[in-house]
């Protein structure tokens, strides 16, 4: 039995010991991003570098197709930062009276999708109200929890808006799961 | 052989296990700042209290003269929060007539630094525009993944302006480190 | 003894080993508020859903009554996101004349209750001024960190408002905790 | 070793202007804000000037808004006060001094102005 | 503006007496407050910032407390060379602003 122990006078069985670094683990980085047919009413997913630089998976944890998929059943923690970076955003009385092409706010979910399960499960959501004054103006949103996951669960970050997602440099935007 | 484990009819082996408790640790708070030499195109390095209040290493994992000593290889949870506080940072129009200098901004880099390898490698950038119109303004910067480290490496925490660190309370600025 | 390995030629004893799956653990989820009394001195508590949805408790953590309690000593990862959301905050020289009505700043606390010690400690604080020119705002601030507690301890969320605490959605405003 | 060191004062008449220079050594003068404070004889202290780390905010008292302005060259580890208009009221020793968000914590050995005629 | 008020402007102490210094600020100040001690013909001395925390190489004798519009300098026993000058500044809004001072004389 897995984690089976004796001592001189007793057995004991334990629940599974697994080594730690035998754990699913993944931290993507961010790559430019293509732009992609998302559905209508759901934010568009970000897509992702799993190899190069500081990113890596490991331990049957794959990304494929903008999707990190679970390999085994577990409590998960899961984070990701997306850095925004955009022009002026008038959101004074001004704006309300017709400025459509400003954002007036970021938001960054990391979506839970179950192939059995026809509704894609929001579990995190950052968003943040953009009314910068000046020329121009960047910012990140971290988020980051433990969640139950299971085998075949695939997790993705969607943002607002995919035209301000600073793409620059790996370590300003990413995302990253491992099993606890 | 660390980890083997024995049942009444098969006897396997399994990657080593280790105690939880074992691990490297470290969570360093925040400590008044002095000004110090760095190099030109560096931002300055942080220096920590970690024996204090909430502060600890454990485990091998040593702080000394602004580094985090990683004393085994493998996948750490890295993370740090700071806190800046400033006075008013006019970036409105006003500023862009005639002042070139660009708006203010707040930068929080976690680095690397592998003293086999000439370059220091950023693994986390926190970065945001300051366009406040009040008195005084005051805001955190968070960031945690987790990365693949070797023995020997050095993580520090960089900021762009240490003048602006809130070194005032050990909750508001912090940085710490796990073994997974 | 738990965690004894068996070799050919020796025998030793490491430190304890436990199932990972076995670990306390929590993700706790916002709930709508009802007003409560609370220390004059102290910022208003959070309550939160433990069942539902995402949230779960697992392992002995317990929550009642605002807290987490901690079953069992050690380090543990702490976490918790709160989302604010207000209408307009002047912080420019107008308001210093007097908008008492708007609030300047959003804090959140994590803080740990040890009943054989009479103060609470702060463990993170997040702290934001707020001086948004648009006619609403939104904004998350994102805590986390490693503790080393005690059994017994008890961990609550803490803000300055909770009239601005966006409860509507269980993803954007959170609180957790893990045993490492 | 943290040195800060003034200069540029001097006598000039009402009127008048003076720059005064303020030169760094010892730390990483760009990753700091630096402050001007002043002290008339026998009088007490009184902020004048500041200037973030890499010179995108600067912020002056309400007795020299306008007169004065404050800069600094990074490349040459130097802070800089351009006093113009100057008058009989701003006689005083200027210091420069490195500046967090909780105190004044180096200061120069400061250099004297004298506004007369 | 916010204004600083100490109190008292002149006080008279003798070697070992324990000496309090009060500022009062006009606004709330959180403890965005710093002491200094200023001799004659001397630049001033760090000696307490953030309200009440002790400046690295300041005696232990002085400390600081308070926080929001009330605060506190105290030296618990007078030592010859602590007769000077003493300020506080807050740091909480523009402009910076200090007391006006407190002098500390020989008895």
């Known amino acids: 039995l897995k984690g089976q122990e004796f001592a001189p006078s007793h057995q004991q069985v334990y629940a599974p010991l697994r080594a730690d670094g035998d754990k699913p683990r993944a931290h993507l980085t961010v790559v430019r991003q293509t732009p992609t047919q998302h559905l209508k009413n759901q934010f568009p997913a970000l897509h992702w570098e799993h190899e190069l630089g500081l990113a890596f998976t490991k331990n049957r944890m794959n990304y494929t197709n903008k999707f990190l998929l679970i390999p085994e059943s577990g409590d998960y923690f899961v984070y990701s930062q997306v850095t925004f970076r955009g022009m002026t955003s008038e959101c004074s009385e001004i704006r309300q009276a017709g400025r459509p092409n400003k954002p007036d706010s970021i938001t960054v979910v990391i979506t839970k999708v179950t192939d059995s399960y026809p509704e894609p499960t929001q579990l995190l959501m950052g968003t943040k109200s953009v009314c910068e004054v000046g020329s121009n103006w960047f910012q990140p949103i971290y988020l980051g929890a433990m969640f139950s996951l299971q085998e075949g669960d695939k997790l993705m970050v969607n943002v607002s808006d995919i035209s301000l997602v600073d793409y620059t440099k790996e370590d300003k935007t990413f995302f990253g799961a491992f099993l606890l | 052989l660390k980890g083997q484990e024995f049942a009444p009819s098969h006897q396997q082996v399994y990657a080593p296990l280790r105690a939880d408790g074992d691990k490297p640790r470290a969570h360093l708070t925040v400590v008044r700042q002095t000004p110090t030499q760095h190099l030109k195109n560096q931002f300055p390095a942080l220096h920590w209290e970690h024996e204090l209040g909430l502060a600890f290493t454990k485990n091998r994992m040593n702080y000394t003269n602004k580094f985090l000593l990683i004393p085994e290889s493998g996948d750490y949870f890295v993370y740090s929060q700071v806190t800046f506080r400033g006075m008013t940072s006019e970036c409105s129009e006003i500023r862009q007539a005639g002042r070139p200098n660009k708006p203010d901004s707040i930068t929080v880099v976690i680095t690397k630094v592998t003293d086999s390898y000439p370059e220091p490698t950023q693994l986390l950038m926190g970065t945001k525009s300051v366009c406040e119109v009040g008195s005084n303004w005051f805001q955190p910067i968070y960031l945690g993944a987790m990365f693949s480290l070797q023995e020997g490496d050095k993580l520090m925490v960089n900021v762009s302006d240490i003048s602006l660190v809130d070194y005032t309370k050990e909750d508001k600025t912090f940085f710490g480190a796990f073994l997974l | 003894l738990k965690g004894q390995e068996f070799a050919p030629s020796h025998q030793q004893v490491y430190a304890p080993l436990r199932a990972d799956g076995d670990k306390p653990r929590a993700h706790l989820t916002v709930v709508r508020q009802t007003p409560t009394q609370h220390l004059k001195n102290q910022f208003p508590a959070l309550h939160w859903e433990h069942e539902l949805g995402l949230a779960f408790t697992k392992n002995r953590m317990n929550y009642t009554n605002k807290f987490l309690l901690i079953p069992e000593s050690g380090d543990y990862f702490v976490y918790s996101q709160v989302t604010f959301r207000g209408m307009t905050s002047e912080c420019s020289e107008i308001r210093q004349a007097g908008r008492p009505n708007k609030p300047d700043s959003i804090t959140v606390v994590i803080t740990k209750v040890t009943d054989s010690y009479p103060e609470p400690t702060q463990l993170l604080m997040g702290t934001k001024s707020v001086c948004e020119v648009g006619s609403n705002w939104f904004q998350p601030i994102y805590l986390g960190a490693m503790f080393s507690l005690q059994e017994g301890d008890k961990l609550m969320v803490n803000v300055s408002d909770i009239s601005l605490v966006d409860y509507t959605k269980e993803d954007k405003t959170f609180f957790g905790a893990f045993l490492l | 070793e943290v040195q800060l060191v003034e200069s540029g004062g001097g006598l000039v008449q009402p009127g008048g202007s003076l720059r005064l220079s303020c030169a760094a050594s010892g730390f990483t003068f760009s990753s700091y804000a630096m402050t001007w404070v002043r002290q008339a004889p026998g009088k007490g202290l009184e902020w004048v000037s500041g200037?973030?780390?890499?010179?995108?905010?600067?912020y002056y008292a309400d007795s020299v808004k306008g007169r004065f302005t404050i800069s600094r060259d990074n490349s040459k580890n130097t802070l800089y006060l351009q006093m113009n208009s100057l008058r009989a009221e701003d006689t005083a020793v200027y210091y420069c001094?490195?500046?967090?968000?909780?105190?004044?914590?180096?200061w120069g050995q400061g250099t004297l102005v004298t506004v007369s005629s | 503006d916010i204004q600083l008020t100490q109190s008292p402007s002149f006080l008279s102490a003798s070697v070992g007496d324990r000496v309090t210094i009060t500022c009062w600020a006009s606004?709330?100040?959180?403890?965005?407050l710093a002491w200094y001690q200023q001799k004659p013909g001397k630049t001033p001395k760090l000696l307490i910032y953030a309200a009440s925390t002790l400046q690295s190489g300041v005696p232990s004798r002085f400390s600081g407390s308070g926080s929001g519009t009330d605060f506190t300098l105290t030296i618990s026993s007078l030592q010859p060379e602590d007769f000077a000058t003493y300020y506080c500044q807050q740091f909480n809004s523009y402009p910076l602003t200090f007391g006006g001072g407190t002098k500390v004389e020989i008895k």
């Open positions: 606004q709330g100040i959180s403890t965005y």
């Open positions: 200037v973030s780390g890499r010179g995108g905010s600067t």
């Open positions: 001094a490195y500046w967090d968000i909780s105190s004044f914590d180096y």
